[in-house]
Interface confidence: low
């Protein structure tokens, strides 16, 4: 029997210019009668060139929804009806092509041909896109508030911010032809729920889409879009209701910037330069393709790239990469932000060199990606410590915490956190090595105490990168380094002269210099130590609620004891600053540290004094007594105390706690308490200082209160930011 | 320093109980866990319980829950054992020792051998 | 309850013997294991806790290796007072466990 066909819409969006017209403002207002006059004309124009093509028998509707700069370019979207089995044939290329044809098959022909009775259509300015039903709906939404702008060259415009009496806007936004359009979007409130979405064509098409933003991200206070070319929307839908713009846009057109390089490395080890996408950290445009070539001095060496946040991942089949393709030595890999180091090793095997190829596949990018190059020692890629293959980095063997994600750096370790004897392989202790007493068989504990060592896991790295034996030289009176290095910035870590936390007791006035108290509108939130003229370090959790995240909110107080009272040791700061670790995760908790930059430098008493930094080789013994104060509740769910408290705790091993927490702890964690429960730290004591004394009766800061089951449960210990994990963020921060 | 003092040797018949003291000094119990632990003659060692004598929270290998309580004198900074229900197999000497939290025992008792004899 | 096997259960050594006592643990134990020494009519000592710690006091000839399941105690040059029976136990989890002993004995 007679079977009716199947019919199915296909949506189409696009955009031509007029070359004997041209824009004017008028055109940019919807409700001028310059504009109604004008969409009536152009879509008339519009419907007879589809109609004059084999298309005519499949039109449906069209719309011409915007006008902009080139001397007259008219943005559209139109619909056919297609059978089924006809839909593949009429892609968006087949639909352009037939229409450039169209307009060819005309421009000297004598003849009346509708379409051209007032506009002169240039066949090599149409562009033809595949839209969506759902793509229309968007973008009609928005033609209540839809404003157009072009920007031309040097230029950088602000926009105008969102009409609030809409629930969506959009700007289309046109630069001059060969330039590439750079938005800006900087939000200016700490909390909201507007959205943005920007897309790389001048409508809301969902397959055009670059990036979308959703909500005063605090992770990208800034973001900086780049599109392919010099058209670009930007859609905003209404969060909640505010009378103030939440964010600023501004647009600038730059030139494109070439990706392409040739190097040749030196003979020498480490990071020896950058390679970044196109106007690095702005977002990597649409069509981004980078080619490096590195050329390598001796096939002694590989190639070592060291990503930010990001890593390359082998992709299963040939799905498209959503986050940069990577092509290196004739390998694909895809790009992942991901919130950790990465670092990939190219083995090298030819002196021809290595071409690495980035390209954006798809429309959807993301932040600009920045990687540095470097050489490394193929037959011994990390001296001292551990490769890691699962990704790419050096990590400390036999320390007792697993770094690498599958635990083998702590595989077969004769010696465990500990030191081991060259004579028999016997373990002694750290603390014992280089103490001047020998304990190893034939003394071998005691060797090469005075001079410098090949750098490995408990090694002290001085500033002219060699490296000592002794284990936690600094600050310990007795220069160890030939530079004297361990013996510098040792200003800190001696408490005033003075003489809850759950379990705890009450310190006196000077007891610690470093505790500090975080509080908002007058209420303690968080503790923190100082651990420089200007700089406070705290937890990063304590500013997981958008409410907090402004600096303007806090307060810091150093040389406070009490809560409800002053004394002349006290001193408050407002907040300059605010760095949270570019890797904290919040459900994890993991890189758990912040940083405040005070407004003013602190003034030294005996009240108010920095604490000692640990260098990322020092060792905290698993068993030590260390010390944490706070003004935390003295009980689980219980009010925050008004004295400061303080309470010791013992380190506990690795693993141990890890098993506790199910293997929720991470290396950048550190556990403390007793598995009696009892002392620990609880709610308000956050960010506070663990510190550990060390022989010269300095303090050094191990960890920071993080997180934990409860407070002073049995069985769960307080979990710590673990400082020898973070270090170098600190130090590149502070310093 | 540190010493761990207990009670003398006791004979019992089958069914009775024993009362075993540890009588501490050099360091207050309250800030440790106080353990017991068994050994029969030619045996392992094997642990049956400890307290926290800051606030008497006890805890018992399944092998002598019912039969084993172990209590606290702060005041006397002593920790007490008593072993209901004696069997012949019950004969041993009976240790106290201390622990750190986590740490293992590091200070025992001279301990107290208890025969259990009709 | 977490078992613990020693080996071997006795073994005969000289005066400056190198020797070595294995530990075997029926579950993960992490680094939470001990080591006691034991003379006739004497009440245990700690040697070694969590697999390498040495005691107060402990001599630098005995060390202690190993975490997980598989667990060692070395005493490097045996002197006269170290014949005695060594005990180790799990301090992982309750009830607290020990291995049945090695028995050092003068050969």
């Known amino acids: 029997g007679y079977k009716a066909e199947v019919m199915v819409s296909q949506v189409y969006s696009g955009s031509l210019r007029v070359l004997n017209r041209h824009f004017s403002q008028d055109l940019t207002r919807r409700e001028s009668s310059a504009f109604r006059s004008e969409t009536a004309k152009a879509q008339k124009m519009l419907k007879e060139l589809i109609t004059s093509t084999r298309l005519g028998t499949y039109y449906n509707s069209s719309s011409v929804y915007s006008f902009g700069e080139g001397p007259l370019t008219c943005f559209f979207w139109f619909i056919l009806q297609i059978p089924e089995h006809r839909r593949l044939m009429l892609s968006p290329e087949v639909v352009q092509a037939l229409l450039v044809e169209e307009l060819l098959s005309t421009v000297n022909s004598s003849a009346a041909v509708p379409y051209r009775a007032e506009y002169e259509v240039d066949p090599e300015g149409l562009v033809i896109l595949e839209a969506s039903v759902k793509d229309i709906a968007a973008l009609n939404s928005t033609l209540g508030c839809y404003r157009y702008s072009y920007v031309g060259q040097g230029q950088v415009l602000r926009l105008k911010g969102p009409d609030h009496l809409a629930s969506s806007c959009l700007w289309h936004l046109q630069g001059p032809k060969d330039l590439m359009l750079k938005l800006r979007l900087e939000w200016t409130l700490a909390e909201c729920r507007d959205r943005l979405a920007m897309y790389d064509v001048a409508g809301p098409l969902e397959k055009r889409l670059i990036t979308s933003v959703y909500g005063c991200s605090r992770q990208e206070p800034v973001v900086e879009v780049l599109a392919s070319g010099a058209i670009m929307a930007v859609v905003w839908k209404k969060g909640l209701h505010s009378y103030y713009d939440p964010f600023v846009l501004s647009v600038q057109p730059v030139v494109f910037q070439a990706c392409e390089v040739n190097l040749t490395l030196d003979n020498r080890l480490d990071s020896q330069g950058v390679l970044s996408t196109p106007y690095f950290p702005s977002y990597y445009s649409p069509q981004t393709h980078c080619s490096w070539h590195l050329t390598v001095p001796s096939l002694d060496y590989g190639l070592a790239l060291w990503f930010d946040a990001y890593a390359l991942r082998r992709q299963k089949y040939d799905l498209p990469c959503t986050q940069g393709q990577w092509t290196i030595q004739n390998r694909r890999l895809c790009g992942l932000r991901i919130l950790q180091p990465y670092a990939e090793r190219i083995p090298v095997v030819a002196t021809a060199g290595i071409t690495i190829n980035f390209t954006s596949q798809i429309s959807l990018t993301g932040p600009g990606v920045r990687v540095h190059y470097g050489l490394y020692n193929q037959s011994d890629p990390c001296p001292g410590e551990f490769l890691c293959s699962v990704n790419g980095l050096c990590v400390p063997a036999c320390d007792g915490v697993k770094d690498c994600p599958n635990g083998l750096d702590e595989r077969n370790c004769v010696c465990r956190a500990t030191f081991q004897c060259k004579e028999d392989s016997t373990c002694i202790s750290l603390p014992k090595v280089c103490d001047g007493q020998p304990d190893c068989l034939n003394g071998s504990d005691e060797e090469q105490c005075q001079e410098g060592v090949p750098c490995g896991t408990f090694t002290f790295q001085c500033e002219d990168r060699s490296c000592v034996k002794k284990p936690n030289p600094q600050c310990d009176g007795r220069p160890d380094c030939r530079d004297g290095s361990d013996e510098e910035h040792c200003d800190c870590g001696l408490q005033g002269p003075s003489s809850r936390i759950v379990g705890g007791a009450v310190s006196s006035e000077g007891e610690w210099p470093w505790q500090a108290s975080l509080q908002v509108r007058g209420r303690h939130i968080c503790g923190g130590a100082l651990i420089a003229d200007r700089w406070v370090i705290t937890a990063a959790h304590c500013f997981q609620e958008d409410s907090m995240a402004s600096t303007v909110l806090w307060t810091v107080f150093l040389g406070k004891v009490w809560q409800n009272s002053r004394w002349p040791g006290e001193v408050s700061f407002k907040v300059s600053r605010l760095l949270l670790h570019p890797y904290h995760e919040e459900d994890s908790h993991d890189y758990d540290v912040a940083l405040l930059q005070l407004d003013h430098p602190v003034v030294r008493s005996a009240a108010v004094r920095p604490v000692c930094l640990p260098a990322r080789s020092h060792f905290f013994e698993p068993g030590l007594h260390c010390w944490i104060t706070g003004w935390g509740a003295l009980r689980e769910g219980g009010p925050i105390s008004n004295a400061l408290q303080k309470v010791d705790v013992q380190l506990i091993p690795q693993d141990l706690c890890s098993e506790v927490y199910r293997y929720q702890v991470t290396p950048r964690m550190l556990c403390a308490g007793y598995r009696k429960g009892k002392k620990d730290a609880c709610q308000g004591d956050s960010g506070g200082p663990l510190v550990c004394k060390a022989l010269s009766g300095r303090w050094f800061l191990a960890g920071l209160v993080s997180w934990g089951l409860g407070c002073g449960r049995p069985n769960y210990f307080g979990v710590y930011t673990r400082i020898t994990g973070v270090i170098s963020w600190i130090q590149q921060v502070v310093t | 320093q540190v010493q761990l003092v207990q009670s003398g040797a006791e004979v019992k018949k089958p069914g009775a109980s024993v009362k075993v003291s540890c009588k501490a000094s050099g360091f207050n119990i309250e800030d440790y866990y106080m353990h017991w632990v068994r050994q029969a003659p030619g045996q392992r060692l094997e642990w049956m319980g400890r307290?926290?004598?800051?606030?008497?929270?006890?805890t018992y290998s399944p092998k002598f829950q019912g039969r084993v309580t172990i209590i606290p004198d702060t005041s006397a900074n002593t920790a007490y054992m008593e072993l209901s229900s004696l069997r012949s197999e019950d004969t041993a000497v009976y240790y106290c020792?201390?622990?750190?939290?986590?740490?293992?025992?590091?200070?025992w008792g001279q301990g107290t051998l208890v025969t259990v004899s009709s | 309850d977490i078992q613990m096997t020693q080996s071997p259960k006795s073994l005969s050594a000289s005066v400056g013997d190198r020797v070595t006592i294995t530990c075997r643990a029926s579950q993960d134990v992490t680094t939470a294991l001990a080591w006691y020494q034991q003379k006739p009519g004497q009440s245990p000592k700690l040697l070694i806790y969590?697999?390498?710690t040495r005691h107060s006091g402990v001599p630098s000839r005995f060390s202690g290796s190993g975490s997980g399941t598989d667990f060692t105690l070395t005493i490097s040059s045996l002197q006269p007072e170290d014949f005695a029976t060594y005990y180790c136990?799990?301090?992982?989890?309750?009830?607290?466990?020990f291995g049945q002993g090695t028995k050092l004995e003068i050969k």
């Open positions: 020792a201390r622990s750190i939290y986590l740490d293992p025992m590091d200070y």
């Open positions: 969590w697999a390498t």
């Open positions: 307290i926290d004598p800051e606030d008497g929270e006890t």
């Open positions: 136990q799990q301090h992982y989890s309750t009830p607290y466990t």
